[in-house]
């Protein structure tokens, strides 16, 4: 598994997936209605 400082930090932050890769941030629009269009 990855043992670089970055990977350790991510692992500590709970951001690693089971496969050991960093989970990609999903774009989930929050407060859509607070934005005009």
């Amino acid at each position: 598994s990855c043992n670089t400082a970055t990977c350790v930090t991510h692992r500590l932050a709970g951001l690693l997936s089971r496969s050991g890769g960093v989970v990609k941030d999903n774009f989930v629009p929050t407060n859509v209605g607070s934005k005009a269009f």
């Epitope: 629009p29 859509v32 607070s34 005009a36």
Partner: antibody
């Protein structure tokens, strides 16, 4: 420059379906939701729903469930709206509009339902 | 569904006049969910004010918005000929998002 280019006017018969498009450019397509709005001739604005192109998640006005279907194609940065079982009540201008406070709307697609 | 009631429905104003359009919501909404649009004849709508009081990019400073709860307003400090349009409020607090029925502003 952000642009939303909508497909041209449509003349269709009652009972048919139509699929209109909204091609986005000038921004990252997956970073904003795309809204669709209906405006009958001489009348006000009615929100149909929106699609999140990142994951194709949708939210609809209950009134348009079963009438409108929103989809998107990331590869071409294009949002689509299909309207089914058309009646004269569906004759209107349909706008796409980018979510976010910057106020970008398409020019509108005029749909005429007539036999 | 939240119903937005605008008044007046139609109004005519002289150049230089101060204009106020009101928008009353059937349920209380947070100001961050209330927006105003302008639609000139033959054109797409455009956002004027977002989150009740924030001026959208490129909108003249004579436009302003205020309000809270169920009562909101759009003000034009000094009416100009180019302001002839229909104005709509819109709420994004609950789905379905809804628009007011519009206020048509004409010039005397």
């Amino acid at each position: 420059e952000v642009q939303l280019q909508q497909s041209g006017p449509e003349l269709v018969k009652p009972g048919a379906s139509v699929k209109m498009s909204c091609k986005a450019s000038g921004y990252t397509f997956t970073s904003s939701v795309m809204h669709w709005v209906k405006q009958k001739p001489g009348q006000g604005l009615e929100w149909i729903g929106y699609i999140n192109p990142y994951n194709d998640g949708t939210k609809y006005n209950e009134k348009f469930k079963g009438k409108a279907t929103l989809t998107s194609d990331k590869s071409s940065s294009t949002a689509y709206m299909e309207l089914s079982s058309l009646t004269s009540e569906d004759s209107a201008v349909y706008y796409c509009a980018k979510g976010g406070n910057d106020g970008y709307w398409g020019q509108g697609t005029t749909l005429t339902v007539s036999s | 569904e939240i119903v937005l009631t605008q008044s007046p429905t139609t109004m005519a104003a002289s150049p230089g006049e101060k204009i106020t359009i009101t928008c009353s919501a059937s349920s209380s909404i947070s100001s961050i969910y209330l927006h105003w649009y302008q639609q000139k004849p033959g054109f797409s709508p455009k956002v004027l004010i977002y989150r009740a009081s924030n001026l959208a990019s490129g909108v003249p400073a004579r436009f302003s918005g205020s309000g809270s709860g169920t009562s909101y307003s759009l003000t034009i400090g000094t009416m100009e000929a180019e302001d002839v349009a229909t104005y709509y409020c819109q709420q994004g607090s609950t789905i379905p998002f809804t628009f007011g029925s519009g206020t048509k502003l004409e010039i005397k």
